[in-house]
């Protein structure tokens, strides 16, 4: 019996098609992606094949202003629309609390939302009770296939899921749950979740009836052969890993941003067995067109975004100095506000010793496109926000050694007055350095805020310490020469959307005026 | 639990025919194929033909095309192997065999002989 | 068609003994390759599919690898309840084709 799982992950509010990069689209032509795109595609594979499910692993919020303005409304219509088979709950749909995935999505949901591992507990478990399941089994063609959530265990360092719902360890929550399948008599069972690949894999082995496992969250991308576009392939599609029960399992995942469709092809016996599986991500590029209907239905939401960009966030009664001229030589304000906006972006108050799980920011001064002049009656818009932050990144949290922030510091002024990128604005550091040493010894001094403290200080950074810190994802992939930071990162958890947190933020102070305070020396 | 279950032996006369029928439970009989494979005493297993349940269609390896006829009946779950013109040679033990060769009948003797 | 030599046609071993059995394909089946076990009483099972899978129940004293035209089925630690006749068997293509048999018996 042969079934064919499309499936996407990490499409983050990217329903309009996309650049190449997954950034605005500008020439249509060349542009990629979107829900009208992948709808004639994935249309196309159900008139061909008999036996299909459309699966999504998480992470549709978060990532556009669509998110911002809709708030998962969007996410709902369109996959209700798209006629989704299943869904996992990722991180980022807990991002406006737990009220902000139940009313525009698990309610207007016409699809199952899967977790596992998340139990609700308190007031919030009859609330939530029954619009996320565990598992569902869902009917396909003759046969019936069982499909199971699970949602990365660190949500509440990286969302806000609130305190009433306790994120359990993946492989010990899905067991249960896969052997109650099995006594339903359901021998298919799919692990589709928000975890990242290397959990992928160790659910792959280690959950003993899990036949295939399809996942989110690293963005991984998988191929087998010439990979169609930019994207390096960390490994062949499917993965197939080895269970400790000696089983092939295939583990796949999609990248992200909507840009491929995943399509894989498994075989099963009579006994639930995978027999063969083979398939690829599909690029969704302009040779694929979109689909009227949705494409209208787009063009229709639309309208409320062009609105919402000129609308005013808040105030600022000082110069917000992103320029060129400061951000690249010196600390600039700019700099600061967006460090300040993207701690409190993360704050989590998840364990007493704590004050926060995060107190440092890294930000490439190169990253600041604009300033934005108080003179125009201080109105901080969308639009403004769009000029400052213009690449679509996201603010990414990273577990990084002493060491490799050192290392950072030091290349952020190794060429120091040529006017480059790699300048690095900050917030929760304090840095001394000394321009007048030769480059990759310039940094005597470098202070951290403490996290494990009541009252926030100061401290020498220690070489060894394993230190959390909110960047840029250009940084964390490594861009403007940040090499260390890519190769020697211990753990990298995609964020919110840079204009979102910053104007998140804006609209919660209301009035702002940050200052030049000496973060930087 | 798969289970299949074939009927008993049988004595044929050469230049006759017979029908071995097996009954399958425990699983979603119109989704998958039957493959049925012969066993002639002493010697190795050969692979006969299948046919999928759903809408009949049939694949036969070219030694038996001609000669044998698989058929199926899907309100009783059965699927049937008929092999036409016996010579002594036909003598064997007919397995009948779920998609992929998971699940076995218990086999059944065919003996060709005047 | 694909032929499937396999060998050897018989080997004698104890217990304990770690025993492979080999097939080797005419031309490439990608993992299309299933482990079958025929006691003496009649009974097949399957053991392996798609080259290196364990059937549900089997014990992990049996493995199998290979990939293209060569494959082999190892029992790491030979069983008294082990002795029996051992067949390969293709199905990448049509025909699917049988191995000959191995017969491990008792030495």
């Known amino acids: 019996w042969e079934l064919t799982i499309l499936h996407t992950n990490d499409v983050h509010s990217r329903l309009e098609q996309t650049s190449e990069d997954s950034s605005k689209c500008v020439n249509a032509s060349r542009c990629m992606g979107g829900v009208a795109r992948l709808f004639t595609k994935v249309q196309q594979i159900r008139r061909a094949e008999p036996n299909v499910l459309l699966l999504d692993a998480g992470d549709q919020y978060q990532g556009t202003i669509w998110f911002t303005v809709y708030k998962g409304a969007e996410v709902a219509h369109f996959m209700n629309a798209l006629r989704y088979d299943a869904m996992a709950l990722g991180n980022h749909e807990f991002d406006n609390g737990v009220e902000g995935l139940i009313e525009p999505l698990l309610k207007e949901a016409k699809f199952p939302i899967l977790s596992a591992n998340i139990k609700a507990k308190g007031p919030l478990a009859s609330q939530i009770s029954g619009l996320y399941l565990p598992y569902k089994v869902l009917p396909v063609g003759d046969e019936v296939v069982g499909i199971v959530g699970y949602t990365s265990k660190e949500t509440p360092f990286l969302s806000n899921p609130g305190t009433n719902l306790v994120f359990e360890d993946e492989i010990t929550a899905l067991q249960p749950e896969v052997d109650k399948l099995k006594t339903l008599n359901v021998n298919k069972i799919i692990a589709l979740g928000h975890s990242g690949f290397e959990m992928d894999k160790l659910i792959a082995q280690k959950v003993r009836g899990v036949d295939v496992v399809v996942g989110g969250h690293s963005n991984t991308f998988l191929y087998t052969g010439n990979p169609p576009s930019k994207e390096v392939p960390a490994g062949k599609y499917p993965f197939i890993v080895t269970s400790d029960d000696g089983r092939k399992v295939p583990v796949v995942q999609a990248y992200a941003f909507g840009k491929y469709l995943g399509y894989l092809k498994i075989e099963f016996d009579e006994r639930g067995n995978v027999i063969s599986s083979h398939g690829n991500p599909i690029l969704l590029n302009s040779s694929i067109p979109e689909d009227p209907s949705i494409k209208a239905d787009i063009n229709k939401w639309r309208i409320k975004l062009d609105n919402y960009s000129t609308q005013e966030l808040g105030k600022t009664i000082v110069y917000l100095d992103g320029s060129s001229q400061s951000c690249r030589f010196r600390e600039c304000n700019m700099g600061n506000l967006i460090c300040d906006a993207m701690i409190n972006n993360n704050l989590r108050h998840t364990d007493e010793m704590f004050w926060n799980h995060v107190s440092m920011c890294i930000l490439n001064g190169g990253g600041i496109r604009s300033p934005i002049d108080e003179r125009n009656n201080g109105t901080i818009t969308w639009e403004n926000l769009a000029a400052v932050l213009p690449f679509g990144g996201t603010f990414d949290l990273v577990q990084l050694k002493g060491s490799t922030l050192k290392k950072a510091f030091e290349h952020s002024v190794h060429r120091y007055g040529q006017s480059t990128g790699e300048f690095l604005q900050v917030g929760g550091i304090h840095v001394v350095y000394d321009l007048s040493r030769k480059p990759g010894d310039r940094v005597v001094k470098l202070d951290v805020l403490c996290t494990k403290c009541r009252v926030p200080s100061y401290d020498p950074l220690k070489m060894d310490e394993v230190y959390k810190v909110i960047l840029p994802n250009f940084l964390a992939n490594g861009g403007d020469g940040f090499q260390m930071i890519k190769d020697e990162l211990l753990r990298h958890d995609s964020g919110d959307q840079d204009i979102n947190v910053v104007s998140t933020y804006i609209s919660k102070m209301k009035v702002i005026y940050p200052a030049v305070e000496g973060r930087i020396k | 639990e798969v289970q299949l279950v074939q009927s008993g032996a049988e004595v044929k006369k050469p230049g006759a025919s017979v029908k071995v029928s097996c009954k399958a439970s425990?699983?979603?009989?119109?989704?998958?194929?039957m493959n049925w494979v012969m066993q002639a005493p002493g010697q190795g297993l050969e692979w006969i033909g299948r046919?999928?349940?759903?809408?009949?269609?049939?694949f036969y390896s070219q030694k038996f095309k001609g000669r044998a006829t698989l058929t199926v009946d899907k309100s009783t779950s059965t699927v049937y192997m008929e092999l036409s013109s016996l010579r002594s040679e036909d003598t064997a033990v007919y397995y009948c065999?779920?998609?992929?060769?998971?699940?076995w009948g218990q086999g059944t003797t065919v003996t060709v002989s005047s | 068609d694909i032929q499937m030599t396999q060998s050897p046609s018989s080997l004698s071993a104890s217990v304990g003994d770690r025993v492979t059995i080999t097939c080797r394909a005419s031309?490439?089946?990608?993992?299309?390759l299933n482990w079958l076990q025929q006691k003496p009483g009649g009974a097949l099972k399957r053991l392996i599919y798609?080259?290196?899978s364990l059937d549900s129940g089997v014990p992990s004293r049996f493995s199998g690898s290979g990939s293209g035209t060569e494959y082999t089925l190892t029992i790491s630690s030979l069983q008294p309840e082990d002795f029996a006749t051992y067949y390969c068997?293709?199905?990448?293509?049509?025909?699917?084709?049988f191995g000959g048999g191995t017969k491990v018996e008792i030495k």
């Open positions: 065999a779920t998609s992929y060769v998971g699940d």
């Open positions: 425990g699983y979603t009989f119109t989704a998958y194929f």
């Open positions: 046919i999928y349940h759903n809408n009949g269609d049939t």
């Open positions: 031309q490439d089946i990608g993992d299309s």
């Open positions: 798609a080259t290196s």
């Open positions: 068997l293709q199905y990448a293509s049509f025909p699917w084709t």
